[in-house]
């Protein structure tokens, strides 16, 4: 025999109390997904949180940060501040990127130089605490009567999809 | 206890530069944010810019050419400048600590009038 | 920028009396409110932030409420204590902005 409740939609949850017909979500909750039993309490943004998406009867809230803090963990599980750019968040707050590490956001930790040398090339701009040395040809590209090379394409910003 | 300490001037010539510090105790520089807000004589607040615990900085756009927030984290202070003064400049001048909880001022120093006149 | 209109701008209130103060903002701000108590020659003070979140040893007779585009802050038996100037603020993106006020005058 067919659970009535399967028929409930995303939205809608099986009512025991009411002979198993489907009631709409009561306001502040959701259901993602059909035959459920009740509905799930939508998050709330509150604090240093803020709504990047409205809960609706389908789907939970979404939540970012409020300026100066930006989101860390699964869904933006929590806030921290924001550091410059050049520096990382430790324990005893944001602290200058070492030598020969860098970090061109407010957020995360800081990386090490690209290595050029591993790839054969040359260091043409060399690294700061706030951007990765830029690799240009191989040294033997640059000897005497080696043909002219074409210069590198502009780097992008990480996380900038292209125009 | 949490406090903050403006210090300022009193009074300035127009087109000059207003300088004031901010100095705290009760907390440090190293895990707070400050912001500045300004209050003109018998008028509402206006937030003016912060600088975030790892010295990075937000403006109010309305203002954002003419002012620079620097902090010492050492001496426990702030420093607020605006430079290029008119008389509409004329203000209480605070500055307020940003909590962990949200982007709000929840300690706020006692102000330093700021008169700009010639 | 986001405006923040606050009504009334004054009111005349007892001790004892029931006040609501309602901010409306220019668009969505969530939750992200704080409220603001004033006294004359003396710097703000933090009464309320995330729109009902009341801040440490604010008094419980202040209440916030409201998402979205309109908040209230309740005072729920006007002390002689109270009578301030009251501010909203939103925080949901910058510039950070402020209502005019709302001065709460004895009757």
């Known amino acids: 025999l067919q659970d009535p409740c399967s028929n409930c939609p995303a939205g809608t949850f099986c009512d025991n109390n009411r002979n198993q017909i489907c009631s709409p979500c009561p306001p502040n909750s959701f259901s993602s997904a059909g035959g459920q039993r009740t509905c799930d309490i939508c998050r709330q943004c509150k604090g240093v949180f803020r709504t990047r998406k409205e809960c609706s009867s389908t789907s939970n809230a979404e939540c970012d940060c409020t300026p100066g803090f930006h989101c860390l963990g699964a869904g933006c599980s929590m806030c921290e501040q924001d550091c410059k750019q050049g520096q990382e968040l430790t324990k005893k707050g944001c602290k200058d990127c070492c030598f020969g590490t860098f970090n061109d956001q407010k957020r995360g930790i800081c990386r090490p130089w690209t290595n050029c040398s591993l790839d054969g090339k040359s260091v043409l701009v060399n690294g700061t605490k706030e951007r990765d040395v830029v690799c240009g040809p191989s040294p033997a590209d640059l000897s005497p009567g080696a043909s002219s090379v074409t210069p590198p394409a502009p780097a992008r910003e990480p996380g900038h999809s292209p125009q | 206890q949490v406090q903050l300490q403006e210090s300022g001037p009193g009074l300035v010539k127009p087109s000059e530069t207003l300088s004031i510090t901010c100095t705290v105790s009760?907390?440090?520089?190293?895990?707070?944010?400050v912001h500045w807000v300004r209050q003109p004589p018998g008028k509402g607040l206006e937030w003016l810019g912060v600088i975030w615990s790892g010295g990075s900085t937000d403006y109010n756009p309305s203002l954002k050419s003419r002012v620079t927030i620097s902090k010492d984290n050492s001496k426990n202070q702030v420093s607020f400048k605006l430079s290029s003064l008119t008389a509409a400049d004329t203000a209480i001048y605070y500055c307020?600590?940003?909590?962990?909880?949200?982007?709000?001022?929840?300690?706020w120093g006692q102000g330093t009038l700021v008169t700009v006149s010639s | 920028d986001i405006q923040m209109t606050q009504s009334p701008s004054s009111l005349s209130a007892s001790v004892g009396d029931r006040v609501t103060i309602t901010c409306r903002a220019s668009?969505?701000?969530?939750?992200?409110v704080a409220w603001y108590q004033q006294k004359p020659g003396k710097a703000p003070k933090a009464l309320i932030y995330?729109?009902?979140y009341r801040d440490s040893g604010v008094p419980s007779r202040f209440s916030g409420s409201g998402s979205g585009t309109d908040f209230t802050l309740t005072i729920s038996s006007l002390q002689p204590e109270d009578f301030a100037t009251y501010y909203c603020?939103?925080?949901?993106?910058?510039?950070?902005?402020f209502g005019g006020g709302t001065k709460v005058e004895i009757k």
């Open positions: 995330s729109a009902s």
């Open positions: 009760g907390f440090s520089l190293i895990s707070y944010g």
């Open positions: 603020q939103q925080y949901n993106s910058y510039p950070l902005t």
């Open positions: 307020a600590r940003n909590p962990l909880t949200a982007t709000v001022m929840d300690y």
């Open positions: 668009q969505n701000v969530g939750t992200n």
